[in-house]
């Protein structure tokens, strides 16, 4: 059936970049300016996406493919095909409806986008805090407190065989 239809349907011969013009005896006409058809056999061309305002053009529209947008500096893409632009913030901040706000104490964000996340709880892994967290950086967990005997360096050299009573790290 498909082969029969293609033999009878002159529109199936219209390549990408054209449309089957019913007003002109189903002749293949080029897509008008600012429109495209990405597949053959189309009866209309699609309007090109316009990248304006918060959007800027990453790839121009052609007769066979749509324009592609990204976001103007200061904003970043969200969604499939950069359907939205969202404001950048500084590291140590997150975006809210009130704009960019500093991360609360105990949370951090090391990127220009996304939300503030809680610092790692080192004690859950039986470790101690080696470097304190900031708004921009997570804490760095170090050896377990048991491994740090009084006066011992926090960066320990290769240890000799463990004494009885010490559990492995």
């Amino acid at each position: 059936f498909e082969r029969t239809r293609s033999l009878q349907d002159p529109c199936s011969n219209c390549p990408a970049g054209t449309f089957c013009d019913n007003n002109r005896n189903q002749i293949c006409s080029p897509c008008p300016p600012n429109s495209f058809s990405s597949a053959g056999g189309q009866r209309t061309c699609d309007i090109c996406r316009q990248c304006k305002g918060v959007f800027r053009t990453r790839k121009e529209c052609s007769s066979t493919s749509n324009a592609e947008c990204d976001c103007t500096p200061g904003f970043h893409c969200l969604g499939a095909g950069c359907s939205m632009c969202e404001q950048d913030c500084k590291q140590g901040q997150e975006l809210t409806k009130k704009g960019c706000k500093d991360c609360c104490f105990g949370t951090f964000n090391d990127q220009k986008r996304g939300i503030c996340r809680p610092w790692t709880n080192c004690s859950l892994d039986g470790k101690s805090v080696l470097v304190n967290g900031t708004k921009e950086r997570d804490v760095v967990c170090g050896p377990s407190p048991a491994d740090l005997s009084p006066g011992a360096s926090s960066v320990t050299p290769p240890a000799p065989a463990r004494e009885p009573g010490h559990s492995p790290q």
């Epitope: 305002g53 918060v54 904003f75 969200l78 969604g79 359907s83 939205m84 632009c85 969202e86 409806k97």
Partner: nanobody, 123 residues
Framework: EVQLVESGGGLVQPGGSLRLSCAAS?????SYWMIWVRQAPGKGLEW???????????YYVDSVKGRFTISRDNAKNSLYLQMNSLRAEDTAVYYC????????????????SGQGTTVTVSS
């Protein structure tokens, strides 16, 4: 077709005032957060202010608080930005934008914006 068209820009002296307008068409204006953003010459885009669907929530970037007022008229499908006590650093192209469907829930993306209107503050 969804469209936003800004107007009202121009040349104004420091300390002066301007009122920008944004005419919306092709969508249910009263269902969306609306936003003003601006781009100063040679700078990145900056969020200026936003307003929720019924106008009961309004937020501003610190640098314009107390000087700029965002408002909307849902009956006229219009968004406004009243700018008072203008400064040289307010010189920019101002864009009106529509918040995405999930704006204020998890993301703060804008899915449509206009061509912009130019504001120049100079003596």
């Amino acid at each position: 077709e969804v469209q936003l068209v800004e107007s009202g820009g121009g040349l104004v002296q420091p300390g002066g005032s301007l009122r920008l307008s944004c005419a919306a068409s092709g969508f249910t204006f009263s269902s969306y957060w609306m936003i003003w953003v601006r781009q100063a010459p040679g700078k990145g885009l900056e969020w200026v202010a936003n307003i929720n669907q019924d106008g009961s929530e309004k937020y501003y970037v610190d640098s314009v608080k107390g000087r700029f007022t965002i408002s909307r008229d849902n009956a006229k499908n219009s968004l406004y930005l009243q700018m008072n006590s203008l400064r040289a650093e307010d010189t920019a192209v101002y864009y009106c934008a529509r918040g995405g469907d999930d704006y204020s829930n998890s993301h703060y993306g804008m899915d449509v914006s206009g061509q912009g209107t130019t504001v120049t503050v100079s003596s």
